[in-house]
C-alpha cells in the first residue's frame, strides 16, 4: 500500500502501512516523513541514504530494537527525530551522528537506562530532548551536557529517579542553560540533597506527582534551597496517587527559592487558608493556581505583591473576593461555583479574562465593577446574563471587549459603547442581541475588529449601524437572519478588508452596496439563498476584492438568469472553492456545477 | 460488527462496538462494574493512541431508548498543566492509567442507553478513536 | 552484493572542472538510487547528488546546484558526475555509493578531488 501524499514531494504519512523497510519510492525531497507503527526493527547504516532533505522523521512504534553506527547519517537537515515506543537494545555510539541540524530529539519510552551512555554528545543543535517514561534512576547530567549549550526542555518525567545529590548538577554550574525547562513529574523522589539546586538557574522547573507523603514534600522542597528558577510548578495528576494530607509546611521551603511565577497544578485537597499556605509567595510576580478547590475566598484580598493571578478550573465556595494593589493582569477562566459576579477592587489592572465561568453580571460595566481605569483588555465570553447598564465609565483604555456567547440584555437601548474611543476588537458574535438601535456602535471610532455573528436585527434588515467606523478592517456579520441590507451600510468603511454575510437570508446578490469598500479582499456570501441578481445590470466589486465566496447557495439555472450566470463567470478568477458553486434549480440542473453549465437561451422576436 | 463486553452489574449490561474504519485496540475495564443507581469505582485503560493526546475532548452522543439528546462537549485536556497524566502522552506511547470515578442518586429509567464517543486530539485536530457503548438498564425492584 | 569502483578525481584550479565516474558490477539489478557523497578533513560524510534508476529523478544539494551534473550510462552500467566551475571549498573526498532494494548501501573506495591554484 502507497504512503498517503499530503504534500506533493514534501509530506508523507506512511503510518501502519506494515513496511518492513524504508520506502524507496518517495521522491528525493521529502522534508516530512511519517513512518509510525510499521515493523521496521532495524536501522542499518545510511537507513535514509535517499532522504537527503528529510527535516522530520517520525519512527513512533516501529519495533526498533537496533539503532547501528551512521544509521541516520547524511540526514544533515534533520530538526525532529521521533523515536517513541521503541523497544531500543542496542544503541551504536555513533547511532545519531550526521545529525548537525537536530534541534528535537523524542525517546520516550524506548527502554533508555540512563543518560550516560546515551550517545547524543555531540548534537550541539539540540534544544529539547524528551526521555520522559523510561527507566532512568539517576539524575546525573553527564558531562557531555556542556556541549548541549542550546538546551531549553529536558523531559525526564515518568522516570524512577528517587533521589538527586549535589554532583547530579555539577555540569550546570560550568555552563548555566539560563534558558532549560526541567520537567521531573512522576518521578518517585525521596530525597534531594540540600545544596543539589544551589545558584543554579533554571526558566522552569515542574514537580508534579512526585511525593507519596507530606513530609517528602516538606524535606524534597527544602532541598531546592538556592534555585533561581522562572516558572515554578507543583502539584499533582488526578488519576495519579494523591497526597493524603496537605498544610501550610508542605510550601516553607519555598522561601528559600528565587521564583519569578509559580503555579500549583491539581490538588486533590480543599485549601482553606491560603494566606499563610503561600507564605512564601507573597512576592512573586504571577502566581497561578489550576483545578483546585478554594474554600475561603475573602483571602484574595491579602497584600499580595503579584502582578498576574491565574485562577482555572477551579471550584469556589462564590466569587472570590479580590483587592489587590498590584495586579496587573487576572485571568479567571472556566472555574465553578459563584455564579454571581461581585465587584473587585484592582486598581492596576490592565487585563482581565473572566470567560467561560457561567457569570451572571447585574449591572456592565463601569470602573466600579472592576475598580480600575487601567483596564485594556476585557474577555467576558462564555458566561451567563450580562445587564448592560452602564457605557463603560472610567473604562475608556479599553482597547479588546469580547462578550461572545454570553446574553447581553439591555443593548439596543441606548449607545453602550460610547466612551470606548480606543477601542480595537469587539466581539459580541452569539449573544442574542437584536439590533433596533441605530447608534448601537455610536463611538468606536477607532475599531477595527468587529464580530457580531449569531445575532438578529429589526426585521431582519441591515440598517446604517457603521457610520462611525471609518478605522473597521474585519466585519462577520454571518448568521444574522439577514434578508435584505440598506444601500449605504457599508458606505463609511473604506479601510474595510473582510466582510463575512455568510449563512444569511440572501435572495439576491448586489453589487451596488460594496461601491465605497475600496480596501475590500474578502467578500463571503456562502450559505445564503442567492438565486440571481438583485438588478439585471451587476457592476463590478472594488477592484481590491481578491476572494468571493458564494459556495451553497440556490442558483437558478435558466435562461431568464443567464447574464447573471454570465456574470458569475466573469468573477472566476475570484471565487473561492468553485466546485461547491452548484444549481439548486432546475431540477434536471440541481447539482451541476455552475461554472460548467453552458445556457445558450433563444431570444424570442 | 464486533461487539465487545465490559461488564455487568445488579441493573446494568455494558458493552462497547468501534464506530470508526481504524478499530485500533483499546482496553476497557470497569471495577467494580457501574451501577446507575449509584457508583463509585476505578476506570482502567490500556491504550497506545496514534496521535499525540495533547488537547483531547470527547464528543459525546447519547440516546435514551430512541430520543437523541444534544451532542456534549467534554474538554479533558486543555493543553498545558493538564489534570490527567495521560494528556502528556505521545503518539506511540503506553497509556496504561486507572481514572477514579463515582455518581450517585441519579433516577435512569429502564432501557437502552447509548453513547457514541467521539475522542478528538492534537493540532490539528483529528478523530483518536470512536466507540459507541451500550448500557442496558434493568432497575431492580428495590 | 554491488561492487563499486571510482575514478576521475585529481588536482584543478579554481574555476575548473573535472568528471567522476563510478562503475558498477555484481548485483547490479538490485540498485535503487546511486549517488556521489563527500568528506572534507575533519566533517560529516554529505550528500552531493543522487538519482534513482526507475525514474531518472535527481537531486543536488543547495552548495553545488547549477554547478554539477549527475548521470548515467545504463549499458555501460557507470553513474557520472560532471562538476563544473569548481571552487576550493569543493575539495574533499568523493565517494560513490548504491542503495539496493534491501535498503543496504554500498560504498566506492573514494577518490580524491583538490581544488587549488
Known amino acids: 500500500e502507497p504512503c498517503v501524499e499530503v504534500v506533493p514531494n514534501i509530506t508523507y504519512q506512511c503510518m501502519e502501512l506494515n513496511f518492513y523497510k524504508i520506502p524507496d519510492n518517495l521522491p528525493f525531497s521529502t522534508k516530512n516523513l511519517d513512518l509510525s507503527f510499521n515493523p521496521l526493527r532495524h536501522l542499518g547504516s545510511y537507513s535514509f541514504f535517499s532522504f537527503p532533505e528529510l527535516q522530520v522523521l517520525d519512527l513512533s512504534r516501529c519495533e526498533i530494537q537496533t539503532i547501528e553506527d551512521g544509521a541516520y547519517q547524511s540526514l544533515s537537515h534533520l530538526s525532529t527525530l521521533i523515536l517513541t515506543g521503541n523497544p531500543i537494545q542496542s544503541l551504536a555510539l555513533g547511532a545519531f551522528s550526521g545529525l548537525s541540524s537536530l534541534q528535537k530529539l523524542v525517546a520516550v519510552e524506548t527502554n533508555l537506562a540512563s543518560l550516560e551512555n546515551f550517545p547524543i554528545g555531540h548534537l550541539k543543535t539540540l534544544k529539547e530532548l524528551n526521555v520522559a517514561h523510561n527507566l532512568i534512576q539517576s539524575f546525573k547530567l553527564p558531562e557531555y551536557f556542556s556541549n548541549l549549550t542550546n538546551l531549553e526542555h529536558l523531559d525526564l518525567s515518568s522516570n524512577k529517579i528517587q533521589s538527586i545529590y549535589c554532583t547530579d548538577l555539577r555540569v550546570l554550574h560550568q555552563m548555566p542553560l539560563l534558558n532549560l525547562s526541567l520537567d521531573l513529574s512522576l518521578n518517585p523522589m525521596n530525597f534531594i540533597q540540600p545544596g543539589a539546586f544551589k545558584e543554579i538557574r533554571l526558566h522552569k522547573l515542574t514537580l508534579r506527582n512526585n511525593f507519596d507523603s507530606l513530609n517528602v514534600m516538606k524535606t524534597c522542597i527544602q532541598g531546592l534551597a538556592g534555585l533561581e528558577v522562572h516558572r515554578l510548578v507543583l502539584g499533582e495528576f488526578r488519576n495519579e496517587g494523591n497526597l493524603e494530607k496537605f498544610d501550610k509546611s508542605a510550601l516553607e521551603g519555598l522561601c528559600n527559592l528565587t521564583i519569578e511565577e509559580f503555579r500549583l497544578a491539581y490538588l486533590d485537597y480543599y485549601l482553606d487558608d491560603i494566606i499563610d499556605l503561600f507564605n512564601c509567595l507573597t512576592n512573586v510576580s504571577s502566581f497561578s493556581l489550576v483545578s483546585v478547590t478554594i474554600e475561603r475566598v475573602k483571602d484574595f484580598s491579602y497584600n499580595f505583591g503579584w502582578q498576574h493571578l491565574e485562577l482555572v478550573n477551579c471550584k469556589f465556595g462564590q466569587f472570590p473576593t479580590l483587592k489587590l494593589k498590584s495586579l496587573k493582569r487576572l485571568t479567571f477562566t472556566s472555574n465553578k461555583g459563584g455564579n454571581a459576579f461581585s465587584e473587585v477592587d484592582l486598581p492596576s489592572l490592565e487585563f482581565l479574562d473572566l470567560s467561560r465561568n457561567g457569570l451572571s453580571f447585574k449591572g456592565c460595566c463601569s470602573q466600579s465593577d472592576f475598580g480600575t481605569t487601567s483596564l485594556k483588555y476585557l474577555d467576558l465570553s462564555f458566561n451567563g446574563v450580562i445587564t448592560m447598564s452602564s457605557n463603560f465609565l472610567g473604562l475608556e483604555q479599553l482597547e479588546h471587549l469580547d462578550f461572545q456567547h454570553s446574553n447581553l440584555k439591555q443593548m439596543s437601548e441606548f449607545s453602550v459603547f460610547l466612551s470606548l474611543r480606543n477601542l480595537i476588537y469587539l466581539d459580541i458574535s452569539h449573544t442574542h442581541t437584536r439590533v433596533a438601535f441605530n447608534g448601537i456602535f455610536n463611538g468606536l471610532s477607532s475599531l477595527e475588529v468587529l464580530k457580531m455573528a449569531g445575532n438578529s436585527f429589526q426585521e431582519n434588515f441591515l440598517p446604517d449601524i457603521f457610520t462611525e467606523l471609518r478605522n473597521l478592517t474585519f466585519l462577520d456579520l454571518s448568521q444574522c437572519q439577514l434578508e435584505q441590507l440598506s444601500p449605504t451600510a457599508f458606505n463609511s468603511l473604506s479601510s474595510l478588508q473582510v466582510l463575512n454575510m455568510s449563512h444569511n437570508n440572501f435572495f439576491s446578490l448586489d453589487t451596488f452596496p460594496y461601491k465605497c469598500l475600496n480596501s475590500l479582499q474578502v467578500l463571503d456570501y456562502s450559505l445564503n439563498h442567492i438565486m440571481t441578481s438583485k438588478k439585471q445590470e451587476l457592476q463590478h466589486f472594488p477592484s481590491s476584492l481578491a476572494f468571493l465566496n458564494l459556495t451553497q447557495n440556490d442558483f437558478a439555472c435558466t435562461c431568464e438568469h443567464q447574464s447573471f450566470l454570465q456574470w458569475i463567470k466573469d468573477q472566476r478568477q475570484l471565487l473561492v472553492e468553485v466546485e461547491r458553486m452548484e444549481c439548486a434549480t432546475p431540477s434536471d440542473k440541481q447539482g451541476m456545477p455552475v461554472l460548467s453549465l453552458n445556457i445558450t437561451c433563444q431570444m424570442n422576436k | 460488527q464486533k461487539q465487545y463486553w465490559v461488564c455487568n452489574s445488579s441493573d446494568a449490561s455494558i458493552s462497547y462496538t468501534y464506530c470508526d474504519k481504524m478499530q485500533y485496540p483499546i482496553s476497557i475495564n470497569v471495577n467494580p462494574c457501574i451501577e446507575l443507581k449509584r457508583s463509585k469505582g476505578l476506570l482502567h485503560i490500556f491504550y497506545i493512541p496514534r496521535r499525540d493526546l495533547k488537547q483531547l475532548y470527547f464528543n459525546l452522543y447519547i440516546t435514551v431508548n430512541t430520543m437523541n439528546l444534544p451532542k456534549r462537549k467534554e474538554v479533558i485536556c486543555r493543553g498545558s498543566d493538564d489534570d490527567y497524566s495521560f494528556c502528556r502522552a505521545l503518539k506511540g506511547e503506553t497509556v496504561n492509567t486507572t481514572i477514579s470515578f463515582s455518581f450517585k442518586g441519579i433516577k435512569f429509567s429502564k432501557g437502552k442507553y447509548k453513547c457514541v464517543v467521539e475522542a478528538i486530539s492534537g493540532s490539528p485536530e483529528e478523530m483518536l478513536f470512536c466507540l459507541e457503548f451500550v448500557i442496558l438498564h434493568q432497575p431492580n425492584s428495590n | 552484493e554491488v561492487q563499486l569502483v571510482e575514478s576521475g578525481g585529481g588536482l584543478v584550479q579554481p574555476g575548473g572542472s573535472l568528471r567522476l565516474s563510478c562503475a558498477a558490477s555484481?548485483?547490479?539489478?538490485?540498485?535503487?538510487?546511486m549517488g556521489w557523497f563527500r568528506q572534507a578533513p575533519g566533517k560529516e560524510r554529505e550528500h552531493v547528488a543522487l538519482?534513482?534508476?526507475?525514474?531518472?529523478?535527481?537531486y543536488y544539494a543547495d552548495s553545488v546546484k547549477g554547478r554539477f551534473t549527475i548521470s548515467r550510462d545504463n549499458a555501460k552500467n557507470t553513474v557520472y558526475l560532471q562538476m563544473n566551475s569548481l571552487k576550493p571549498e569543493d575539495t574533499a573526498v568523493y565517494y560513490c555509493?548504491?542503495?539496493?532494494?534491501?535498503?543496504?548501501?554500498?560504498w566506492g573506495q573514494g577518490t580524491q578531488v583538490t581544488v587549488s591554484s
Open positions: 538519482i534513482r534508476f526507475k525514474d531518472g529523478s535527481i
Open positions: 555509493a548504491a542503495k539496493t532494494g534491501t535498503s543496504f548501501v554500498c
Open positions: 555484481g548485483s547490479i539489478f538490485s540498485i535503487n538510487d
